[in-house]
Interface confidence: low
């Protein structure tokens, strides 16, 4: 299926449109820095050129790979230098040494100032006087911040912009129309760039086997009905679609997304039942649809899985035979009968058998060696369903305020050389679990809560992986993917941990305190019971929350004051002294 | 979309023989193990043999051992089984299933062995 020009090819399949944007995510998530109207030019270029090889195949240049195209035009960026330091050297090697290296520049926490959102009616105007280019710039704001970010996926989050504010800007109150639109869409796209972070990481880090057997359970569980060489395939395009993908590689993973799109909705029968209503969709609304698509049900006569996998006289035999195909067809045998599994508990379950067959198959007795195989996997399934059910009754217990304030202390004192942004920021991603999962039904609770943790702690692994300062936390990220989350739960406090000095300075507060939003209020907070945990790391739970307490009762004392910032200057001193003495 | 469609059943004397094809599409055949699984009237389904992806490595059940062989045709994304000296207890519906499981994912083809 090669073509004389990929470029030409890319653009007949995608349309201008879609093109353009995915040239611009692809460009502003390798130069994150770059100012937005570089970007558009850069763009620009490439789509004039892209419409001359549309029209003459044999046209100058026409033939190059993409990478050398896109990679050409990144480099005649004149600042690179200067901005990106050594990410410009990358700019004397050749493909695909060239694009490896701009993919490692890729910088998950780049130093970019917060999108503040400006008044209402001035984002009206700004819509309405150029829709394009406002679109084009939320494009650029969130694929620069977001290096990782699913790229035909945020084609589908600036569909649902755009229709947010074509539909707002003419409502009668455009705030209350408009701003919940655009909460949604900032939640609903972090929790997507976080997700899409751990595919890449799972994909980079542990390699295309790894991300497979993730697929197969994951499929397995959606699509419970279809053939195990059905789900394969599906696996099989998906690996590709996120490779591709993963590694800046837009246009083909846009369109191979696109042909499987195309294949499961023509192919729905030996699929899933629940497809139906996704294939009526256009196409961003139905590759969205389709990932995020409900469990089937399960065939109601699914025989038990011993009797192939236990019982059977033959198991070593074809273990041997083809391990990896024997392996999957396990996991998608375990996973369609199991949708209340967590995707990462299946995996465990699949690599504990795995582990049993290479000893047992060994042995003098193989069958008398693996007979009691499934007995073994009820430790790994109690563990966290155990978790789930205590961290919820916990949430129940607490809210999610002081619940978020629970896992800060425990993680803090787990790692607490990891850095007081970095331990609130995935602290309170952590405790969010509970009111995403815990009210949800016991069966939907596991999945939900386990999946979910994967994810925040990838982003801990990921942060961490650019400033490494804990051991541990290196070992549990890159030891073994499905056992991360086991791995964190199991840390204890670390007592090799000299605690921090005491630094007045972090805990001196201003009037500005008062004017912040309830979230910005409780980070502030936040930070400061991190700094405390990291003074005191083996103060107990009640010195730590009758110190919370009394600054709680502090700023709100202050913020009620006329003179507020001599409320703050008089009243701050008086509050680190008795938090010291408290925590002596 | 996953098929398998088998063929080349029929009705044949005690001692006569039988090539049984299944003609796959919609996944990459190449790349799995296959089997053929047979069902008598009234029994549970029971592995018959089994072929590797690269049709190196054949397996087969002691009850058809010396009288059955399992082949296959990557570029035709078609599996086979010879059946020589059929006898009266090989009648069955036969189905070819990827890798080597046991349940039924295609409609089958009858054998019926009988004077």
């Known amino acids: 299926d090669t073509h004389k020009s990929e470029v030409a090819h890319r653009f007949k399949d995608l349309g201008e449109e879609h093109f353009k944007g995915l040239v611009l995510v692809a460009f502003s998530q390798y130069l994150q820095q770059c100012p937005f109207e570089e970007h558009v030019k850069l763009v620009n270029e490439v789509t004039e050129f892209a419409k001359t090889c549309v029209a003459d195949e044999s046209a100058e240049n026409c033939d190059k790979s993409l990478h050398t195209l896109f990679g050409d035009k990144l480099c005649t960026v004149a600042t690179l230098r200067e901005t990106y330091g050594e990410m410009a050297d990358c700019c004397a090697k050749q493909e695909p040494e060239r694009n490896e290296c701009f993919l490692q520049h890729k910088d998950d926490n780049p130093n970019l100032p917060p999108l503040v959102r400006p008044e209402v009616d001035v984002m009206c105007t700004a819509f309405h006087d150029n829709e394009a280019t406002f679109l084009k710039k939320y494009l650029y704001e969130v694929a620069r911040r977001h290096p990782y970010f699913y790229a035909p996926e945020l084609l589908f989050f600036a569909a649902r912009y755009k229709a947010a504010f074509a539909e707002c800007c003419q409502a009668a109150d455009k705030a209350a129309c408009l701003l919940p639109k655009l909460d949604e869409l900032r939640d609903e796209g972090k929790a997507s760039s976080a997700k899409q972070r751990l595919k890449c990481a799972s994909l980079q880090k542990f390699g295309d086997r790894a991300f497979k057997a993730w697929a197969v359970a994951r499929l397995s569980q959606k699509f419970p009905k279809a053939e195990f060489a059905e789900v394969s395939k599906l696996v099989t395009d998906l690996t590709k679609v996120h490779t591709e993908c993963c590694h800046g590689d837009l246009l083909e993973c846009a369109d191979d997304r696109a042909d499987l799109a195309k294949y499961m909705c023509e192919n729905q029968d030996s699929i899933s039942s629940k497809l139906k209503e996704c294939c009526d969709k256009p196409l961003l609304e139905k590759s969205h649809c389709l990932a995020e698509v409900e469990n089937d049900e399960m065939p109601a006569d699914l025989p038990s899985l011993a009797a192939d996998y236990v019982e059977s006289k033959d198991v070593c035999k074809n273990y041997a035979e083809a391990k990896d195909v024997f392996l999957g067809m396990f996991l998608y045998e375990y996973a369609r009968r199991h949708p209340d599994y967590s995707v990462m508990l299946l995996l465990r379950l699949a690599k504990a058998y795995e582990a049993t067959l290479e000893k047992c198959c060994a042995a003098a007795d193989p069958h008398e060696c693996y007979a009691k195989v499934f007995d073994e996997f009820q430790p790994l399934v109690e563990e966290p369903q155990n978790l789930v059910k205590q961290n919820c009754e916990l949430f129940e217990q607490l809210g999610e305020y002081k619940f978020q304030n629970a896992l800060l202390v425990r993680y803090t004192k787990k790692v607490p050389q990891v850095s007081t942004p970095t331990l609130v920021e995935v602290s309170r991603n952590l405790g969010k679990v509970g009111a995403k999962c815990c009210k949800l039904p016991e069966a939907k609770r596991m999945p939900c809560a386990e999946d979910y943790l994967s994810v925040v702690l990838n982003r801990l692994c990921v942060l961490h992986e650019k400033t490494p300062v804990s051991e541990k936390v290196t070992k549990c990220c890159t030891e073994s993917l499905v056992n991360r989350r086991p791995c964190f739960s199991a840390l204890e406090l670390d007592e090799a941990y000299v605690p921090k000095a005491f630094n007045a300075e972090t805990f001196t507060f201003h009037a500005d305190m008062c004017t912040l939003s309830e979230k910005e209020k409780q980070v502030k907070k936040q930070t400061a019971l991190v700094e405390l945990v990291k003074h005191k790391p083996k103060a107990t739970k009640e010195q730590l929350k009758g110190v919370m307490d009394n600054f709680a009762a502090f700023v709100e004392k202050c913020c009620k004051a006329d003179d507020k910032e001599a409320c703050f200057a008089e009243e701050g001193p008086k509050f680190v002294a008795a938090s010291q003495a408290a925590l002596a | 979309q996953v098929q398998l469609v088998e063929s080349g059943g029929g009705l044949v004397q005690p001692g006569g023989s039988l090539r049984l094809s299944c003609a796959a599409s919609g996944f990459t055949f190449g790349s799995f193990g296959m089997s053929w699984v047979r069902q008598a009237p009234g029994k549970g389904p029971e592995w018959v043999s089994a072929i590797d992806s690269g049709g190196a490595d054949t397996r087969y059940a002691e009850t058809v051992k010396g009288r059955f062989t399992i082949s296959r045709d990557n570029l035709k994304k078609t599996l086979y089984l010879q059946m020589n000296s059929l006898k009266p207890e090989d009648t069955a519906v036969y189905y070819c299933?990827?890798?080597?499981?046991?349940?039924?994912g295609s409609q089958g083809t009858q054998v019926t062995v009988s004077s």
């Open positions: 299933t990827i890798g080597r499981s046991t349940s039924r």
